[in-house]
Interface confidence: low
């Protein structure tokens, strides 16, 4: 029976710079069992290099020197005695680019090296970008823990250095942001910022990175409400408005909060389960009644809380004047005055531009006044 | 060599309290997040309990919250799972497990397990 | 909560067939999924990770694919000392969640 010497492996392989790749491979080579069992020692070699002399890139022999350039970054993986050469690359550097060739040899009659069968290593510029990971939703004021990988990498070589970059870091231990992960308490001022995180090999130039946006969930915190684009001015979640009666009234409710909150606005001080007057966060009264002095409440709805704020409306209405009419009655002339006005109007009596005060007497003139509101009454 | 080693488990009575141990050695114990895995007799995986290098964060599954504490001592490279109010069901082989760190939270190093017995 | 459903839940397989294992997330886990070799009374121990990657020291014959929800491994060639429970788990959200297991059992 012929010799067979035969090596299944890959033509090329392309790998990143500073990433990891395996070649898969397997050989066989004649060997009979009646033989005696000599250990069998397979290399991995640069191309053109006399397997004699030269260091080799990988072997399982112990007593053969091992390139150290190479130490610790191309190692055999799988099990020799079952044929199986496969080698294993990792953090790739531009000076691996090249052929390879695989050796086996056992006792005095195996010594061969599959010329014809060479491994082209090809170490490209790295393209590939670090993924950022967050293990649950950023939400305001929780801590969460994020994590920068890059697939492809392994732990050959020399260890990977991280640097994070960001406006949300700024208050954190320059330390902490040199891990491969990171606990972020993120702020609702920090949605929609930049995150950077780069990876760099110790001692090589090799760097790369991603930039991600953040995207923050955090409940209102403040509620404003807009009249004709101007923010309505709240005190203790109160915000007063004065308004004409008839009027028309358009006001905007916002609530910055991410997602957005649902805004919806409700007459008076409502309870948690009342009808909206509106489901989204505009109020259009086309005209204003004295009746709506009672306000209405604009209610931002998040799922993680929500707030509301009163709008306490001032009813104004345009002054009506009725009379003043005259007339003559038993006890002498009876002079009567009516307006209407809201907030209800005082009213004043004037003899030869003298003021009569109300409910008073001067001499032989007698003034009764009432304010009910709207109306106020004299006579 | 990269290793761990759980120690803590034994026999515990239905509402007691056990502390497992896990000691690392053979690499940098603050760079990886590490958890613990438990297995029921008989039974398929289950994640318990995860946390970050630093400690900072800590994770639960709903079955164990409120009644487990995971903490780790980076100075004495330790991990720890603090157990209390134990049920017949907490009863398993727990191990503590390495984050790779090329994978948030996939574990390339497992500790050989430490059997917690839950039972009256 | 992710659920991981394993399908099958065993199988029986013969040296140097090649076995598919499928796994099935209730939603999408990126490609944050592993899977891992358990033997009887031994520790798990991580095959793939990042759904294709093979973990250093692993023999080639071991392949993970799929995106999304749908991953399958692939043992391309099965040999005597891969008899043994697999188990697939996500790691994109927590809680973490391994799937149910699958028995491969010499025929």
């Known amino acids: 029976e012929k010799p067979v010497y035969e090596l299944q492996v890959q033509k090329s392989v392309t790998v990143q710079e500073g990433l990891c790749v395996l070649v898969p491979c397997s050989f066989s080579y004649p060997w009979r069992s009646w033989y005696s069992s000599p250990p069998l020692y397979v290399y991995w070699f640069r191309d053109g290099e006399i397997p004699y002399y030269a260091e080799v890139v990988a072997t399982n022999n112990p007593d053969r020197r091992v390139k150290p350039e190479t130490q610790g970054r191309f190692r055999l993986l799988g099990d020799v005695q079952k044929k199986n050469c496969s080698l294993s690359i990792g953090d790739a550097r531009m000076e691996d680019t090249g052929s390879y060739f695989f050796r086996v040899e056992r006792g005095r009659d195996v010594k061969y090296s599959y010329q014809q069968n060479k491994l082209n290593l090809e170490v490209t510029a790295l393209i590939e970008k670090p993924d950022i990971h967050f293990l649950e939703p950023l939400e305001s004021g929780r801590p969460t823990r994020l994590s920068c990988s890059l697939p492809g990498s392994c732990e050959a070589g020399p260890p990977l250095t991280f640097s994070w970059t960001g406006n949300a870091l700024s208050p954190l231990d320059p330390e902490t942001t040199r891990s491969s992960e990171l606990t972020l308490t993120p702020r609702p001022e920090d949605h929609g910022t930049n995150l950077t995180c780069q990876m760099k090999r110790q001692g090589a130039q090799v760097t790369t990175e991603r930039t991600v946006q953040l995207n923050v969930s955090y409940a209102p915190q403040t509620i404003t409400i807009f009249r004709n684009g101007i923010a309505l001015e709240i005190l203790q979640n109160t915000s007063y408005l004065p308004v004409l009666e008839g009027q028309a009234l358009r006001l905007l409710c916002d609530a910055p909060s991410n997602p957005p909150a649902h805004l919806s606005w409700f007459q008076g001080s409502p309870a948690l389960n009342a009808t909206p007057i509106s489901n989204t966060g505009i109020l259009e009264l086309r005209r204003v009644r004295s009746a709506e002095k009672g306000g209405f409440t604009c209610r931002a709805q998040h799922p993680l809380g929500f707030l509301q704020i009163f709008l306490n409306l001032s009813v104004y209405s345009l002054p009506q004047l009725l009379g003043p009419s005259c007339s003559w009655e038993a006890e002498g002339l009876h002079c009567r005055c009516s307006f209407r006005a809201w907030p209800a109007p005082s009213l004043c009596w004037r003899l030869e531009e003298k003021p009569l005060e109300g409910n008073s007497s001067q001499g032989s003139f007698k003034v009764n006044s009432s304010s009910p509101g709207p109306w106020a009454n004299s006579s | 060599e990269v290793q761990l080693l759980e120690s803590g488990g034994g026999l515990v009575q239905p509402g007691g309290s056990l502390r497992l141990s896990c000691a690392a050695s053979g690499f940098t114990f603050s760079n990886h997040a590490m958890a613990w895995v438990r297995q029921a007799p008989g039974k398929g995986l289950e994640w318990v309990s995860g946390?970050?290098?630093?400690?900072?964060?800590?994770y639960y599954a709903d079955s164990v919250k409120g009644r487990f504490t995971i903490s780790r001592d980076n100075s004495k490279n330790t991990l720890y799972l603090q157990m209390n109010s134990l049920r017949a069901e907490d009863t398993a082989v727990y191990y503590c497990a390495r984050d790779l760190l090329a994978l948030p939270y996939a574990f390339d190093i497992w500790g050989q397990g430490t059997l917690v017995t839950v039972s009256s | 909560d992710i659920q991981m459903t394993q399908s099958p839940s065993s199988l029986s397989a013969s040296v140097g067939d090649r076995v598919t294992i499928t796994c099935r997330a209730s939603?999408?886990?990126?490609?944050?999924l592993s899977w891992y070799q358990q033997k009887p009374g031994k520790a798990p121990k991580l095959l793939i990770y990042a759904v294709s990657t093979l973990q250093s020291g692993v023999p080639s014959r071991f392949s993970g694919s799929g995106s999304g929800t749908d991953f399958t491994l692939t043992i391309s060639s099965l040999q005597p000392e891969d008899f043994a429970t697999y188990y697939c788990?996500?790691?994109?959200?927590?809680?973490?969640?391994f799937g149910g297991g699958t028995k491969v059992e010499i025929k």
């Open positions: 939603q999408s886990t990126s490609s944050y």
């Open positions: 788990q996500q790691s994109y959200s927590v809680p973490l969640t």
């Open positions: 946390i970050s290098g630093s400690a900072a964060s800590t």
